[in-house]
């Protein structure tokens, strides 16, 4: 029976040319972790496997760094960055848990615009 | 279900090469991560080297680092170690592990195959 529950980062906003971190926690379970993948749409960004170790995909090896913990950041955002990411937990013996994350990534002036405006 | 069998053990002199095989049945593993770990008498298991997206990423211990090759051959399903320049210290038995993939969630784990480096 699958007890467990994702909390992620949610719907999160960055700069073009910035970082950003996405994270995933895993609670309510003591299920163990065997491996985190890491998706945007149907690509595989990233893989952390509990006893084979971090491997980023070729294609994001220059703008993708593992960590901090199970999370991931990207680097160098640029607006094509803008969509859905996902923490895919294989547990066990659990099952495989999913977390979903919006990235929108914001041309610097909008950014900057939209920080302005905030309401305290 | 999914079989990880290794080969290419043996024993050979300090100094010598071996090249061990690991060959995936059952599931493919070119978007996973596969790799080696090895057991020496009276200790615990541990991590050698990993490889992924069929060689781009590689993933290696400091004790094997210079000495050590992980490759894969996606086409044949099958996961290489080239073990050079051999120690008496890397007598172990060596595993092939491959990361899970859905629905199983759990790394799996060939039966090993026996290397001795005699000096």
């Known amino acids: 029976m699958m007890t467990g529950t994702i909390e992620t980062t949610g719907n999160i906003s960055a700069e073009k040319g910035g970082s950003i971190i996405l994270q995933c926690h895993l609670s309510s379970t003591t299920a163990q972790v065997t491996q985190v993948n890491w998706e945007q749409q149907d690509q595989l960004l990233a893989i952390c496997n509990a006893d084979l170790g971090w491997h980023i995909s070729p294609s994001f090896k220059d703008r993708v760094a593992p960590g901090p913990g199970l999370g991931l950041t990207l680097q160098s955002l640029t607006v094509n960055d803008t969509g859905e990411y996902f923490c895919i937990y294989h547990t066990y013996p659990d099952g495989t848990y999913t977390g979903r994350i919006f990235l929108e990534v914001l041309e610097s002036s909008v950014a900057e615009h939209g920080a302005r405006f905030q309401i305290p | 279900e999914v079989q990880l069998v290794e080969s290419g053990g043996g024993l050979v002199q300090a100094g010598g090469s071996l090249r061990l095989s690991c060959a995936a049945s059952g599931r493919t593993f070119s978007n996973n991560v596969m790799g080696w770990f090895r057991q020496a008498p009276g200790k615990e298991r541990e991590f050698v080297a990993a490889?992924?997206?069929?060689?781009?990423?590689?993933n290696y211990a400091d004790s094997v680092k210079g000495r050590f090759t992980i490759s894969a051959d996606n086409a044949k399903n099958t996961v290489y170690l080239q073990m050079n320049s051999l120690k008496p210290e890397d007598t172990a038995v060596y595993y092939c592990?491959?990361?899970?993939?859905?629905?199983?969630?759990?790394?799996?784990w060939g039966q090993g195959t026996q290397v001795t480096v005699s000096s």
């Open positions: 592990a491959a990361g899970p993939k859905t629905p199983d969630t759990r790394n799996y």
């Open positions: 490889i992924s997206w069929g060689g781009a990423s590689t």
